[in-house]
């Protein structure tokens, strides 16, 4: 029964997390434009994201307009959108494959190769996890690189936007909803059967026999 | 005293290279960015790039990539500028500045250096 | 890249007099504008950064102004040493640009 909890909690982070994931990598809030000085009030924000770039008027007005040209993008940005789209598509894998061999579904009959199936898939969410994590980070250390770089000059400096925050929330869920499925999983591939059939010979009702007759293998 | 010592006048054929030298001292070296200005006769100055003494990261203006290569030798605090492939159109003087603290202005200049691009 | 636009190139000047350069950017600079002062023969000289501040040596006579696009450099009571070119630089982005230069000469 704790199996079960555990993996249906695993489960529902590795949910939220892929939710998460799919915000992070929409959401044009990557960089946003940082604005250095106490003197100055500034007219406009920028935000910049993967796939788009807003521009948010003081006046509360926004304008956004998506990256024209594929090529033109810098390989840093393209490598970024790849990641994330493949981390989104390796957790929908998951998914299936959790499905799969879940303890609810009929999918798979034979109970090792359930175990088997929650395993791999609690695997493939931490792959998951990982591949969100790789474009966050890099992104973020290129970031902190040129806040403190002396030669980038204000204009092109930023900050560390909302969606890279849901970045770590969305990788941090997927490892921890990846791991706590691996972790409901027996260690042994051979435990799981022999675990069940334990359960069924202590309840079997006894047969009245000659002491003689109890195989002593039974008894440690 | 902050000081930037500039290399002397450099007389080069056209599809030549040269090499222009910075000697700076009376202040630590690693602690400021350094920048070089072109400055046509008679014309306005241009940015040409600027370069972090202390790891060696530089940055070009886009005009100047490709044309212009900019280096430092910590040993000797002096920065250098190779220009490669010249033509008529780089005959200039070549200011190298180093940023202030503060602010992305130049608030010390070397002397210049005069280079002259003829057959 | 922005471009910065001294509008006159010029100025024929008498001593004592109160002088104001102009300095118009393609775009908001954000105070980012440092003035020099270049006589002939020598490297430009920092007078002014952050549009406003005056640089250690830079005599009071000389003053910053302006927010947005537009700036302006100001001498009061105009002074022999005073003839030069004067430039404006924006920090804000790079590539750094100069604007055009404007000199002042001596009636």
């Known amino acids: 029964m704790a199996s079960a909890g555990m993996q249906i909690l695993g489960v529902v982070l590795t949910l939220l997390g892929w939710v998460n994931g799919l915000v992070s990598c929409a959401l044009p809030m990557w960089k946003v434009t940082a604005f250095i000085g106490n003197s100055i009030v500034v007219a406009q924000v920028v935000w910049e994201g993967l796939w788009m770039s807003c521009v948010v008027q003081s006046t509360g007005q926004m304008q956004c307009k998506v990256y024209d040209s594929l090529l033109a993008l810098p390989q840093d940005l393209q490598a970024a959108r790849a990641l994330c789209v493949i981390a989104l598509l390796v957790a929908l894998f998951g998914l299936l494959v959790y499905l799969a061999g879940a303890k609810c579904t009929t999918c798979v009959e034979e109970k090792d190769s359930k175990a088997r199936l929650v395993l791999t898939s609690g695997i493939v969410f931490v792959i998951s996890g990982v591949l969100t994590l790789i474009p966050v980070c890099w992104t973020a250390h290129a970031i902190i690189r040129d806040f403190y770089n002396p030669l980038v000059a204000e204009a092109q400096k930023r900050e560390l936007g909302a969606s890279l925050y849901l970045g770590w929330a969305a990788s941090g869920l997927l490892l921890l909803g990846g791991g706590l499925l691996c972790c409901t999983c027996p260690s042994g591939g051979s435990q799981g059967p022999s675990h069940y059939m334990a359960r069924y010979s202590t309840s079997a009702p006894a047969i009245s026999r000659g002491p003689s007759e109890y195989p002593t293998k039974n008894y440690v | 005293e902050v000081q930037l010592q500039e290399s002397r006048p450099e007389l080069v054929k056209p599809g030549a290279s040269v090499k222009i030298s910075c000697k700076t001292s009376g202040y630590t070296f690693t602690e400021y960015t350094l920048h070089w200005v072109k400055q046509s006769h008679g014309k306005s100055l241009e940015w040409i790039g600027g370069i972090n003494p202390n790891n060696g990261d530089t940055i070009y203006n886009q005009k100047f990539k490709g044309k212009a290569t900019l280096t430092v030798d910590k040993s000797s605090s002096t920065a250098y500028m190779e220009l490669r492939s010249l033509t008529s159109e780089y005959s200039a003087v070549y200011y190298c500045?180093?940023?202030?603290?503060?602010?992305?202005?130049?608030?010390?200049w070397g002397q210049g250096t005069s280079v002259t691009v003829s057959s | 890249d922005i471009q910065m636009t001294q509008s006159s190139s010029s100025f024929s000047v008498s001593l004592g007099d109160r002088v104001t350069i102009t300095c118009k950017a393609s775009?908001?600079?954000?105070?980012?504008l440092a003035w020099y002062q270049q006589k002939p023969g020598n490297a430009p000289r920092l007078l002014i950064s952050?549009?406003?501040s005056l640089e250690t040596g830079t005599p009071s006579r000389f003053s910053g102004s302006g927010s947005g696009k537009d700036y302006t450099l100001s001498i009061t009571s105009l002074r022999t040493e005073d003839a030069a070119t004067y430039y404006c630089q924006q920090y804000w982005s790079t590539p750094l640009t100069f604007g055009t230069g404007t000199k002042l000469e001596l009636k």
């Open positions: 952050g549009a406003t």
């Open positions: 500045a180093r940023r202030a603290i503060t602010v992305y202005a130049m608030d010390y």
């Open positions: 775009e908001d600079i954000y105070n980012r």
